[in-house]
């Protein structure tokens, strides 16, 4: 913490301007009034403060607003945002997308993924849902940030907004997030024709259940291997060799390359070797001929 001293009369601060860059840390602490700083935050980012000086300014604001900064201050934080921790940001209530844009721009090129994720979370809470304007802002200023949101926050996305999400926005989404987004996408795109539908739904398919994958296999979609590899293991395992062949079309040859990787490896282990041989790819590890397959999962569910 900065030690407190009294401010020399000649150093008294009446406005936030460039003269402050010549103040030592303790002079800033003693001479800058927190309320004045808050009122003139829009000037701070234009002044080349050192990181040490920014620490002092942050300390001032923290003392003035122990419950969290008001949005009028947050909007003008500029490079002071780089000093904020996720714990600081968690106290904020942010509703303006202009505020979000400004801070996303500042964070570019800095290792601030935790702070940005928390900021986006606060925006979603502040606005009540992840509406189209918010999604548009995220996709424009922070590709991939959508996936920083928790499944609980993503559940507030209306299906009508899903069309604004681009494939690259979902690259870093995990299964739990896709579980939330996929059904919304299926609802949002359900009026499209087969081929158009597949193009739209493809980035979300990591959240699809088995029955949807089976249904896709009946539609000549020729799924690429990258999409197939992102399918849930549990969605792939029940598929027959014929269904996978129809699903992948000409891309079926790629199974050989992915033979040792999940979910292909796990799927191979569940197929009869005879059936795998029909693909002509030399896939090995299937159930040998003459072996009986008992599906204990259904039996357990019945007992």
């Amino acid at each position: 913490d900065v030690e407190r001293t009294t401010c020399p009369p000649e150093k008294e601060v009446h406005e936030i301007d460039e003269s402050l860059i010549f103040y030592k840390k303790r002079e800033l602490e003693a001479c800058v009034d927190a309320a004045l700083l808050a009122a003139q935050m829009d000037r701070v980012d234009a002044i080349p403060f050192t990181y040490e000086q920014l620490d002092v300014l942050k300390h001032k604001l923290d003392e003035l607003y122990p419950q969290g900064y008001p949005e009028s201050v947050i909007r003008h934080l500029g490079h002071l945002f780089l000093k904020m921790s996720p714990e600081d940001i968690r106290k904020w209530n942010v509703t303006s997308l202009e505020t979000l844009k400004a801070l996303l721009k500042v964070s570019k090129g800095h290792e601030m993924s935790a702070q940005v994720a928390t900021l986006i979370d606060r925006v979603v809470v502040g606005r009540g849902q992840l509406d189209k304007d918010t999604v548009d802002t995220l996709t424009a200023f922070c590709p991939g940030c959508l996936c920083s949101l928790s499944p609980e926050r993503l559940s507030s996305v209306p299906p009508s907004v899903i069309g604004a999400v681009r494939p690259q926005d979902l690259d870093t989404c995990g299964p739990r997030q896709l579980d939330v987004l996929y059904p919304k996408a299926r609802l949002a795109f359900q009026n499209m024709s087969g081929s158009e539908y597949f193009v739209k739904i493809r980035p979300f398919l990591g959240g699809a259940p088995t029955e949807d994958v089976k249904a896709l296999s009946q539609q000549n979609v020729s799924m690429d291997l990258a999409t197939f590899m992102k399918l849930r293991r549990e969605a792939v395992l029940p598929l027959t060799v014929a269904e996978v062949q129809k699903l992948l079309g000409p891309h079926v040859e790629g199974l050989k390359v992915e033979e040792q990787h999940s979910p292909v490896r796990d799927w191979i282990l569940k197929q009869r070797q005879d059936d795998l041989d029909t693909l002509g790819l030399g896939l090995q590890g299937g159930i040998p001929n003459g072996y009986l397959i008992l599906d204990l999962s259904v039996r357990e569910a019945l007992s």
Epitope: P209, A215, S297
Partner: antibody, heavy 122, light 107 residues
Framework: QVQLQESGPGLVKPSETLSLTCTVS????????WSWVRQPPGKGLEWIGY???????NANPSLKSRVIISVDTSKNQFSLKLSSVTAADTAVYYC????????????????WGRGTLVTVSS | EIVMTQSPATLSVSPGERATLSCRAS??????LAWYQQKPGQAPRLLIY???TRATGIPARFSGSGSGTEFTLTISSLQSEDFAVYYC?????????FGQGTRLEIK
């Protein structure tokens, strides 16, 4: 073939929590989305919400604050908890399978349990 | 939410005759509409989805039509087992919503 069976108390006191379980037999719970739908005596149907085997849910906004839908894949079961019940929650509660396959693109129900009547009364 | 309104509330028709049931949506649901039949003490049974596609095992006398906000379920020649309550359901958006039902009774 796949069958659904609801189970739980038939009588719940006002302000308490209604708890029901649906057991899926003859197939894996992992393949579909599963819903709860209710029907007050002599009235129409109301969708409560759905769950995916991973635990991802979506509920009717009119009930959302009181509803918890959960899943137990090891038992092939999913459950409904409805808190702070009143007499207006007296209904036959059905569990149902949402088809929604891409081939037919939609969220409707092709398989239903027989339903269980839950009465809210002191 | 999308409100589904069915008419009439009760329809009296003689066996062998044609029955026409209506369902109206408060906003467009495209063709994302299903019809169910429910008999006393039983769960609903899916008849039609996609506004006009018959579900597996449903007799050809059941047909659906319409899109947008106006839909019709037609039963061409009523059999004794067809007397029941019929519900429409939209799945164009969440929450999924049902009509209040049309009771089809013997005249």
């Amino acid at each position: 073939q796949v069958q659904l069976q609801e189970s739980g108390p038939g009588l719940v006191k006002p302000s308490e929590t209604l708890s029901l379980t649906c057991t899926v037999s003859g197939g894996s719970i992992q393949n579909y989305y599963w819903s709860w739908v209710r029907q007050p005596p002599g009235k129409g149907l109301e969708w409560i919400g759905y769950i995916f085997y991973s635990g991802s849910t979506n509920a009717n906004p009119s009930l959302k604050s009181r509803v918890i839908i959960s899943v137990d894949t090891s038992k092939n079961q999913f459950s409904l908890k409805l808190s702070s019940v009143t007499a207006a929650d007296t209904a036959v509660y059905y569990c149902a399978r949402e088809v929604g396959r891409i081939a037919v693109a939609g969220w409707f129900f092709d398989l239903w349990g027989r339903g269980t009547l839950v009465t809210v009364s002191s | 939410e999308i409100v589904m309104t069915q008419s009439p509330a009760t329809l009296s028709v003689s066996p062998g005759e044609r029955a026409t049931l209506s369902c109206r949506a408060s906003q467009s649901v495209n063709s994302n509409l299903a019809w169910y039949q429910q008999k006393p003490g039983q769960a609903p049974r899916l008849l039609i989805y996609g506004a006009s596609t018959r579900a597996t095992g449903i007799p050809a006398r059941f047909s659906g039509s319409g899109s947008g906000t106006e839909f019709t379920l037609t039963i061409s020649s009523l059999q004794s087992e067809d007397f029941a309550v019929y519900y429409c359901q939209q799945y164009n958006n969440w929450p999924l919503t049902f009509g209040q039902g049309t009771r089809l009774e013997i005249k």
